[in-house]
Interface confidence: medium
């Protein structure tokens, strides 16, 4: 079951999965000036079998200037940017990825990848926060988040965490002892707060134009 | 032709902010349905080659609409034009109702 | 590529509908109904999986290049056309659509 939406944005903060979930997707996306080749894959697909997981189809990006050539090398690490999504900006090591059953290693990068890496998720994963540089970790409770399915309803839960503008950086995921707060609203697995995601969606004309349109809307 | 098509769609019952992708998709009378286009709330796109020098997609999250813009339009281009959410791995659920959209010169 | 272009079949008889990809899709591809006037609706996707609300006379299977969707026992509201999707390679595209109508 994929999650209804993006893990939840935390001021200052950034987040990693340490391991993907099978069924996760990650897009297949191209920079400024590269587009997926004809007949390219959409995105990757964590899948496995009994015996490991690993990720199905190959993103590829040839120029758009350019027609029938692709390359799938492996960037240089200078040409690695930062990957607004989930990539962190200090390193990591807590979670052996290759331990944990039913998970992806993180995708190798390729070559000419967008900046932004737009994963899907699926219930169960869980994700990990970390201050950005120039930002310290004041923890309320865990600094991750976890898809889960309530009532039907997909949800993740709150991070527990506040990056305060002091010039220290914490490490990964956060070596400060959690401090028990009166603010922090712990999550509850009871209580359903009752919402519709029965998505409706409609048309309307945004502009005349030039030459004459004429429009009729279905009903 | 020097037109330029534009057409919102609107969002209810849940956020344009939500893991999906927000789609464009036409279809000329009697003929099968052409996709066109999407957007992800980051702003992230993507375009069908045969138009992409043609088409923007846009994405308004405070109004949880997002648009479509076609430039120089011709009679080719005279088509129903559906938005739809599309969900990575099971394809387009719901639609909008559907624009007709006549270009004539 | 779908076929056959138009089917025609009498109420309460079994329908089937066919995709060919022109390279494997694995099972990324969807089924949809358009009746006249109307939004197309998500029958199935992921090549088998009902969509939410859609009736167990509804089946689809197949994997790499080959697809069927079987309705199997079409009722009055069943006649429509229906297009199959393939989502996994770029750009995502649609098939020319089955038209199954009244015999």
């Known amino acids: 079951e994929l999650c209804d939406d993006d893990p939840p944005e935390i001021p200052h903060a950034t987040f990693k999965a340490m391991a993907y979930k099978e069924g996760t997707m990650l897009n297949c996306e191209c920079k400024r000036g590269f587009r997926r080749i004809k007949s390219g894959s959409l995105y990757m697909l964590c899948t496995g079998n009994s015996s490991h997981s690993s990720w199905d189809n190959q993103c590829q990006c040839t120029s758009s200037a350019t027609r029938n050539t692709t390359k799938q090398v492996t960037p240089q690490p200078e040409e690695q940017k930062e990957r607004k999504t989930t990539e962190m900006q200090s390193p990591m090591q807590p979670v052996d990825q290759a331990s944990l059953p039913g998970h992806c290693r993180e995708p190798p990068p390729w070559e000419n990848e967008a900046t932004e890496r737009i994963y899907h998720f699926v219930v169960g994963q869980m994700v990990y926060y970390q201050c950005v540089q120039g930002y310290r970790a004041l923890h309320r409770g865990p600094a991750e988040s976890v898809c889960k399915m309530t009532h039907g309803k997909t949800r993740w839960t709150q991070p527990q965490l506040i990056c305060t503008g002091e010039m220290e950086t914490s490490q990964f995921p956060g070596e400060e002892k959690p401090q028990a707060s009166p603010e922090g609203r712990p999550e509850s697995e009871t209580s359903c707060l009752v919402t519709t995601t029965d998505f409706q969606i409609q048309t309307e004309m945004a502009a005349t134009m030039e030459t004459s349109i004429f429009t009729t809307e279905y009903q | 032709p020097s037109g330029t098509l534009s057409l919102t769609c609107a969002v209810s019952?849940?956020?344009?902010?939500?893991?999906?992708?927000w789609s464009w998709v036409r279809q000329p009378p009697g003929k099968g349905l052409e996709w066109i286009g999407e957007?992800?709330?980051?702003?992230?796109?993507n375009y069908n080659p045969s138009l992409k020098s043609r088409v923007t997609i846009s994405v308004d999250k405070s109004k949880n609409q997002f648009s479509l813009k076609l430039s120089s339009v011709t009679a080719a281009d005279t088509a129903v034009y559906y938005c739809?959410?599309?969900?990575?791995?099971?394809?387009?659920?719901?639609w909008g109702q559907g624009t007709l959209v006549t270009v004539s010169s | 590529t779908q076929s056959p272009g138009t089917l025609s079949v009498s109420p309460g008889e079994r329908a089937t509908l066919s995709c060919r990809a022109s390279q494997s899709v694995s099972s990324r591809l969807a089924w949809y109904q358009q009746k006249p006037g109307q939004a197309p609706r998500l029958l199935i996707y992921?090549?088998?999986t009902r969509a939410t609300g859609i009736p167990a006379r509804f089946s689809g299977s197949g994997s790499g290049t080959e697809f069927t969707l079987t309705i199997s026992s079409l009722q009055s509201e069943d006649f429509a056309v229906y297009f199959c999707?393939?989502?996994?390679?770029?750009?995502?595209?649609f098939g020319q659509g089955t038209k199954v109508e009244i015999k």
């Open positions: 999707q393939q989502y996994t390679n770029w750009p995502q595209t």
């Open positions: 019952g849940g956020s344009i902010s939500s893991s999906n992708w």
């Open positions: 739809a959410r599309g969900v990575r791995g099971t394809g387009f659920d719901p």
């Open positions: 957007i992800y709330h980051s702003g992230s796109t």
């Open positions: 992921g090549a088998s």
